[in-house]
């Protein structure tokens, strides 16, 4: 198959009724048949990608290069788009035959590898309508969905899932943690026509739920009754002072008293030093502030809870998930440290197909990738040890030379020569 596959399925009515299973559910028609692959990009045809992907026309933007990186599972299969310049914005996009996800599942999937040990940079994709001017894609360009990992500083290591709903970008209310190691990871977003979603990393579910519950698309179903307020006689005190309790008569004693054992120094001169006052000490009989005993409040009514009413502003929307038009996939990113590789892009309507595709791409090469990285790390460790040994050897040699220089000069004769010399002399 070619490196880029685009297939738009818009079946006619006859095809639908003959070939597809029909299911009616919540005003939505579900088509369950052959998977529609709207977009697939694996970068398997060398420089062919340059004719399919469009860069923003701006000289100071970063360049993407085709690379499998410093380590990989398969040098050819693992080639993807790699950010190559530090501290740059990146803007690159590919178009496909426009489609709508109305009445069907949408699956967006791709792999990301931050082999540079990323400090701050995006690893997400944006899905745009086909009205996007690809040559002028930028951070404020309106998109339908933004999905993928984002790392920036110690505080941000998350998977963004953002939907544009009625013209506004709405962020997920949950915190989905992304992978922050140096290996390739598979990110999958599934959006279903029953307004549910699922996020998977490495083909394992990390989050799921309902669009309405996990995003603030709609006003809340319930609101606090604006006409209700806490009655003035509502008593929220669980305990009160015991009215029958009274302070003992001998309670009030000063906190500090003059030290009874202190004596005026003999050399104290009242004219010079003023009137002598004994130093004060803590009064052992001081009891502190008296507080009446606490008893249960007979009028206690508990904490007043503001009653809620149905929000008149709320009305359900069964088509939150749906978009009329998807036509462009874009990488619109900032990276402080470059080196991220994007690969294995897939947009489809079939969850099983996406999982299979993930297993056949990321799944096949992940173990070999780790092996190669481990081998490199081991070689690096060995090289480091060798360098350390060499350094130590050099240091020892230098020390020996220094010692020789410092010690007094002796004739440089071998033991054998010295012994023979002594024998002949004798």
């Amino acid at each position: 198959s070619s490196s880029l596959e685009v297939l738009f399925q818009g079946p006619g009515l006859n095809d639908i009724f003959e070939a597809q299973k029909i299911e009616w559910h919540e005003e939505n028609l579900y088509f369950q048949g052959e998977p529609a692959v709207y977009f697939k990009e694996q970068f398997l045809d060398g420089d062919g990608w340059t004719s399919r992907w469009i860069e923003k026309h701006k000289s100071d933007f970063g360049k993407f290069v085709l690379s499998s990186g410093k380590f990989y599972g398969d040098e050819e299969k693992d080639k993807g788009l790699q950010t190559s310049q530090d501290a740059r914005f990146y803007a690159l996009s590919a178009s496909f035959e426009p489609f709508s996800n109305k009445g069907q599942t949408l699956v967006v999937q791709f792999t990301v590898k931050h082999e540079q040990n990323i400090d701050c940079g995006g690893g997400y994709v944006k899905l745009f309508p086909n009205s996007l001017d690809q040559t002028d894609m930028h951070g404020d360009s309106e998109y339908n969905i933004m999905f993928g990992p984002d790392i920036c500083g110690p505080g941000t290591k998350k998977v963004h899932v953002i939907f544009n709903y009625k013209g506004k970008n709405v962020l997920i209310n949950k915190d989905i943690r992304c992978k922050d190691d140096e290996f390739t990871h598979l990110y999958t977003l599934i959006v279903r026509p029953d307004n549910t979603y699922e996020v998977k990393i490495d083909n394992s579910q990390v989050e799921s739920g309902s669009l309405e519950d996990d995003w603030d698309f709609l006003p809340p179903k319930k609101i606090k009754d604006p006409d209700a307020s806490k009655p003035e006689d509502w008593d929220e005190r669980a305990k009160i002072d015991d009215p029958t309790d009274s302070k003992p008569e001998d309670w009030d004693k000063p906190e500090h008293i003059p030290d009874p054992d202190a004596k005026k120094p003999e050399d104290w001169d009242e004219e010079m030093d003023g009137e002598w006052e004994p130093p004060v000490i803590q009064n052992p009989e001081y009891k502190g502030e008296w507080k009446p005993r606490q008893i249960d409040n007979p009028d206690y009514k508990g904490t007043w809870i503001h009653p809620e009413i149905d929000n008149p502003e709320y009305s359900p929307d069964p088509s939150i998930y749906a978009y009329d038009n998807f036509g462009v996939l874009g990488l619109d990113l900032w990276q402080v440290k470059s080196g991220t590789i994007f690969d294995n892009f897939l947009i489809t309507n079939d969850e099983a197909y996406a999982e299979e595709f993930g297993n056949e791409t990321w799944g096949v090469t992940k173990a070999a990738e780790k092996q190669m990285k481990d081998k490199q790390d081991e070689e690096q460790r060995t090289r480091r040890m060798m360098r350390t040994k060499m350094r130590m050897r050099r240091m020892r040699r230098t020390r020996r030379k220094m010692r020789r220089k410092m010690s007094p000069a002796r004739p440089r004769t071998s033991c054998r020569e010295a012994c023979l010399q002594g024998w002949t002399e004798a």
Epitope: A87, D119, C120, G121, G122, G139, D140, D150, I151, C152, G153, P154, G155, T156, K158, H160, K166, G167, K168, N169, L171, D332, L333, W334, Q335, V336
Partner: antibody
């Protein structure tokens, strides 16, 4: 939570430059975006620009482009705003304000508002 | 460039509800933040992303945003709420502030 402390008041001559500093403490400097906002006497708030220290790049309001330079020194957790070619209309209180870093795109930092502000620095431009 | 329009002043009796509006073309598509500024002090964020309250801001402050108008609502107004209020959005890589509204609590 981060705290922002600004440099003291300045009196400048028209045509000269002023450099105001904003030192952050109590948080990781690289986890914030810093904006500069000014307020002329009796007027509203006006955004001049911002910087994300970890990015090292600044973003300026059209009106101040070419006249303002915003920088950050991560080693001292300090952001700077330099305004050149001063005129009397630049007499104002200059504030630095921070937004938490929520991602690697410019828009994130303004998505949550500016939640911590410096005490303000009064700059008077007079001949 | 994007323009945010606020009324110059709003008055409210103590204990009543004050509503401050912020108009802008399709502002409902943007995230709106609100700041409170008392005389001689730096601004304070009271609402972010249309309707979210930062910690320490009383529940009496709430926000909404749809169509061409965003609204800051202060219920059970108190004398201490008297201040200037500014709305703010992010548009075309720029922060835009409204002109500000002076809230007067009568009495």
């Amino acid at each position: 939570e981060v705290q922002l402390v600004q440099s003291g008041a300045e009196v400048k001559k028209p045509g000269s430059s002023v450099k105001v500093s904003c030192k952050a403490s109590g948080g990781t400097f690289s986890s914030y975006a810093i904006s500069w906002v000014r307020q002329a006497p009796g007027q509203g708030l006006e955004w001049m620009g911002g910087i994300i220290p970890i990015f090292g790049t600044a973003n300026y309001a059209q009106k101040f482009q070419g006249r303002v330079t915003i920088t950050a020194d991560e080693s001292t957790s300090t952001a700077y705003m330099e305004l050149s070619s001063l005129r009397s209309e630049d007499t104002a209180v200059y504030y630095c304000a921070s937004s938490p870093l929520r991602g690697s795109g410019w828009y994130w930092h303004y998505y949550y508002g500016m939640d911590v502000w410096g005490q303000g620095t009064t700059v008077t431009v007079s001949s | 460039s994007y323009v945010l329009t606020q009324p110059l002043s709003v008055s409210v009796a103590p204990g009543q509800t004050a509503r401050i509006t912020c108009g802008g073309n399709n502002i409902g598509r943007k995230s709106v933040h609100w700041y409170q500024q008392k005389p001689g002090q730096a601004p304070v964020l009271v609402i972010y992303r249309d309707s979210n309250r930062p910690s320490g801001i009383p529940e009496r402050f709430s926000g909404s945003n749809s169509g061409n108008t965003a609204t800051l609502t202060i219920s059970r107004a108190q004398a201490g709420d008297e201040a200037d209020y500014y709305c703010q959005v992010w548009d075309s890589s720029t922060v835009v502030f409204g002109g500000g509204t002076k809230l007067t609590v009568l009495g």
